[in-house]
Interface confidence: low
């Protein structure tokens, strides 16, 4: 059977005003872009470009947007059900074991290895040992001991929550 | 399984208006969000509207309040759009989107319909 929502647990005036930001929660859950009042009796919109909700909740409080740091681009901006997608300015990466901030890659490979990944928004250069192909995982290099090449293209976004 | 079937884009003038249709077959439950989202080329899909439980409540992309209104029909199982004083930039192709939620908290599925194409032009 095809049906739409046929819920009556909201106020005349509530279902009459077009623009409304207020509802009743449907058992004790709020949509996303909003969060629960403290009553539990309202659904309240979070603010756009302020704080948001994905998923369907009974928060009191709806979670702020990430804010970019220095270092870092917007991809998209922050709705009211979608957090901000940050991601490393080109040249620097993120990595998961220290995401709190970008790095900035290396500029080349040390001697007698060779690069076989770019430098991205979230990984190093990749280099590897020319005879074993063994990956190099070690310290920046001195510079005339250095393959030099170019950053990477950022290829696809990196999310962060915050 | 839900199905969203959009209709009413086209081609219009600058300043024009056009209301988008979207039918949803299959089985919607009483706790969902029905919305629509655009995507110009090259761009990602964003949030233009969404009415939840019942019609409710409403939630607008900041561009478009004002100039869009989003609104439901639960008799005809429709979801519609009304988009007035149309600009170039509004081209794109609009999705219906419909995020039902399940028992456990946080867990919804989202269904899209395959869009409807809006071409503005000055």
């Known amino acids: 059977e095809s049906a739409l929502i046929t819920q009556q647990d909201l106020a005349p005036q509530q279902r009459a005003a077009p623009q409304q930001k207020r509802s009743s929660p449907s058992e004790g859950l709020c949509p996303p872009g909003h969060h629960i009042s403290e009553d539990g009796r309202d659904c309240i919109s979070c603010k756009y470009g302020q704080d948001y909700s994905t998923h369907w909740n009974d928060l009191l409080f709806c979670l702020r947007c990430t804010r970019c740091d220095s270092g870092e681009v917007e991809l998209s901006p922050c709705t009211t059900t979608r957090n901000t997608v940050c991601q490393c300015e080109e040249g620097t990466f993120r990595e998961e074991d220290s995401p709190e901030m970008c790095r900035k890659c290396r500029t080349g490979c040390p001697r007698g290895m060779v690069k076989v990944g770019d430098c991205t928004p979230w990984s190093d250069i990749e280099c590897v040992h020319k005879e074993s192909g063994t990956k190099h995982s070690g310290e920046v290099p001195a510079v005339e001991e250095t393959v030099t090449s170019s950053p990477g293209t950022p290829a696809s976004p990196c999310s962060l929550s915050g | 399984q839900v199905q969203l079937q959009e209709s009413g884009g086209g081609l219009v003038q600058a300043g024009g208006s056009l209301r988008l249709s979207c039918v949803a077959s299959?089985?919607?439950?009483?706790?969902?969000?029905m919305g629509w989202y655009r995507q110009a080329p090259g761009k990602q899909r964003d949030l233009v509207a969404q009415?939840?439980?019942?019609?409710?409540?409403?939630n607008y992309a900041p561009s478009m309040e004002g100039r869009f209104a989003i609104s439901r029909d639960n008799a005809k199982s429709t979801v519609y759009l009304q988009m007035n004083n149309l600009k170039p930039e509004d081209t794109a192709v609009y999705y219906c989107?419909?995020?039902?939620?399940?028992?456990?908290?946080?867990?919804?599925?989202?269904?899209w319909g395959q869009g409807t194409q809006v071409t503005v032009s000055s």
């Open positions: 989107n419909a995020e039902v939620k399940s028992a456990d908290w946080g867990a919804y599925a989202n269904y």
């Open positions: 299959g089985s919607i439950f009483t706790n969902n969000a």
């Open positions: 009415i939840t439980m019942g019609g409710g409540i409403t």
